[in-house]
C-alpha cells in the first residue's frame, strides 16, 4: 500500500519510516473509520504539518517548511486512512511526527519516526600522484556516516584513512589507499546501514603487455559475476592515462545500448558486448600508446576497475631506420 518508503513497527503505537533525500514518502496512520474526521499531523509536537477537518484541508497555520509538500489520501479518509503523503524529504525533516485523528467516536494519536538517508552513488578512482598510485573510494553525499571497508586479495585491511567533510545535511567522504607497486586486487565497500544499501568498488591490475609498433592489442574487461547484474543499468568506459590524466577512448551505456568511440583505432566487438564482455582492441599501435588503460564498469551498486599496462616498443624496421 505504501510503496515509496519502508517502515518498521516498534512498540507504543510508533512506526519508523525510512526515506531517501529528495524523494517522496508516506507517513502511515490508520484509524477506526467514523464520521466527523479530524486529522492533524504535527512535527516534534510543535510544528503544524497538516490539518484536515470539516471535510477539507485547513493549512492557514501550517509551518512554512511544509508548504506545498503535504497531502492526505482524501478518497481513503472515510476508510480509516489518515496517512500523510510527504514530498521531497530533506534531512531537516527527520524526527517524530504525531498524527491526531478524531472521529465522532474517539480521538487517537499515532507516532511516526522519520529517518532520512542519503547515498549518492559512490565512485572508485585510480590516481597517480607523483610516483605514487592511489585508489580512492569516495561518496559525494551520504547520511548517516557510512561504514567503509577495504580488502586486498579478499583479505580485510585494517588501516584505512577516511577524509570527511560535513555539510549542513550530509557527509562527503574520501577513503584513499596507497597501492604503489602492488599487483594485488583491491575491493572497497561503502555501506549505508540506514538505507540498507551497499556499494562495492573492485580494482584489478592485469599483467603488463609488451607490443610492437603497428601491432594491435586486445585488452580484456569482463565483469565479476558476483557484482554484475545484466538487467541493471550500467556504463562501461575505456580510458587511457597520459601524463597523469585519463582521456576517454570509448564508452557504452547499457540503458540505450549506445557505444560512443572517441579513438578511431579503438574497436569493440558487438557480439562480445551482448555477452557482457567489454574487451577492446586498439589497432595500429604507436609508441605514444604506451601507458595505462582503464576499463570502468559502473552501476548504482558497484564499480569494477580493470587496469592494463601496455608497453609499445619500436618495431625492428623502425629501430634500423634510426
Amino acid at each position: 500500500i505504501f510503496p515509496l518508503a519502508f517502515f518498521i513497527y516498534v512498540p507504543m503505537n510508533e512506526q519508523i519510516v525510512i526515506g531517501r533525500l529528495d524523494e517522496d514518502i508516506i507517513l502511515p496512520s490508520s484509524f477506526e473509520r467514523g464520521s466527523e474526521v479530524v486529522i492533524h499531523w504535527k512535527y516534534q509536537d510543535s510544528y503544524k504539518v497538516h490539518s484536515y477537518y470539516k471535510g477539507s484541508d485547513h493549512l492557514e497555520s501550517q509551518d512554512p517548511r511544509y508548504a506545498n509538500r503535504t497531502s492526505l489520501f482524501y478518497n481513503e479518509i472515510q476508510n480509516g486512512n489518515a496517512s500523510l503523503f510527504f514530498r521531497r524529504v530533506s534531512l531537516l525533516d527527520e524526527g517524530i511526527y504525531t498524527c491526531y485523528v478524531g472521529t465522532a467516536i474517539q480521538v487517537i494519536t499515532n507516532k511516526v519516526v522519520l529517518k532520512v538517508g542519503v547515498f549518492l552513488t559512490p565512485v572508485m578512482k585510480y590516481e597517480k600522484r607523483n610516483t605514487n598510485s592511489f585508489l580512492i573510494c569516495s561518496v559525494l553525499s551520504v547520511y548517516p556516516r557510512p561504514i567503509i571497508t577495504w580488502k586486498m586479495d579478499n583479505t580485510p585491511i585494517s588501516e584505512n584513512n577516511m577524509e570527511e567533510t560535513g555539510s549542513l545535511d550530509s557527509f562527503s567522504i574520501n577513503s584513499p589507499l596507497n597501492i604503489t607497486g602492488s599487483n594485488s586486487s583491491y575491493e572497497c565497500t561503502i555501506e549505508n546501514s540506514l538505507l540498507k544499501q551497499t556499494w562495492t568498488g573492485r580494482w584489478t591490475m592485469k599483467d603488463g603487455l609488451h607490443k610492437m609498433q603497428s601491432e594491435h592489442v586486445s585488452l580484456s574487461c569482463q565483469p565479476v559475476n558476483d557484482y554484475f547484474s545484466p538487467n541493471q543499468d550500467f556504463k562501461v568506459t575505456w580510458s587511457r592515462m597520459k601524463s597523469g590524466t585519463f582521456s576517454v577512448l570509448a564508452y557504452y551505456l547499457s540503458s540505450s545500448q549506445n557505444t560512443i568511440i572517441n579513438e578511431s583505432r579503438f574497436s569493440w566487438n558487438k557480439e562480445l558486448i551482448n555477452q557482457s564482455d567489454f574487451s577492446m582492441n586498439l589497432m595500429d599501435l604507436n609508441l605514444s600508446d604506451s601507458g595505462e588503460y582503464l576499463c570502468n564498469i559502473s552501476s548504482d551498486e558497484y564499480t569494477l576497475l580493470t587496469i592494463h599496462t601496455v608497453h609499445v616498443e619500436p618495431s625492428q624496421e623502425t629501430a634500423s631506420h634510426n
Epitope: V38, D45, G102
Partner: antibody, heavy 120, light 107 residues
Amino acid sequence: QVQLVESGGGVVQPGRSLRLSCAASGFTFSNYGMHWVRQAPGKGLEWVAVIWYDGTNKNYADSVKGRFTISRDNSKNTLDLQMNSLRAEDTAVYFCARDRNTAMDYFVYWGQGTLVTVSS
Amino acid sequence: DIQMTQSPSTLSASVGDRVTITCRASQSISSWLAWYQQKPGKAPKLLIYKASSLESGVPSRFSGSGSGTEFTLTISSLQPDDFASYYCQQYNSYSVTFGGGTKVEIK
C-alpha cells in the same frame, strides 16, 4: 465519566478583571478542543472562545476579542478564561464545554456553569 | 459572522404532537449544524450534529434534516421530558454562532 467543573465566578465591577477556570477529568484532555460558552440571564447561548487540543489555535467571538484570553494547561487538565475590562453585558453563566474532538467546534460535554455578575 | 435565525421563538404543543423547529443560516454552512436541548438551570445537551446525525443516547424521536441554509429539528411525538428550549448552532466558520432559541412549552 467525563466531568467539567467551572470555578472563579462572582461579582465584579465594570472595568475590572476575573479569571475563570475549568477542571477536566474522565478523558484525555490534551486530545480535545475546549470552549467557553455563556448565557446571559433569560437569554440564549453565546459562544465565547475556543482553544485547540494543543493550545496552538485560539478563536474569539467579536464581542470579547482583545479583552478575553483563553488558555489551557494540558499537564494539569485545566482550561482558563482571563476576562479583562469587564462590562455589564458580560454578565452571564459561563460554561466550559468539550469539543467532539480536536477541531469540530460543537459541544458534546458541558460543565454546570459559573455565574459572573458585572455590576457597580 | 454567520447569523442563525431560529423560528418560532416559542412553540406551544401537547404530548404526542409532531413538532418542527427551523433554523436558517445567513450563508451556506453545508451540513455543519448542531442542535441542543436545554432545561432551566441546566447545561445544554447535544441532540444532533452534522445536521442529521443523532448523538449517542438521544431518543430516535428526535431527527434533523437540511443542508446549505435551511435546517429543521423534528420531534416525531412530543414527550413530557421534551418541554425545554432548543438551540441550533453552526460550526462552519471559525466563529461559531447559535440561533436565538425556541422554547417548547405545554399547550
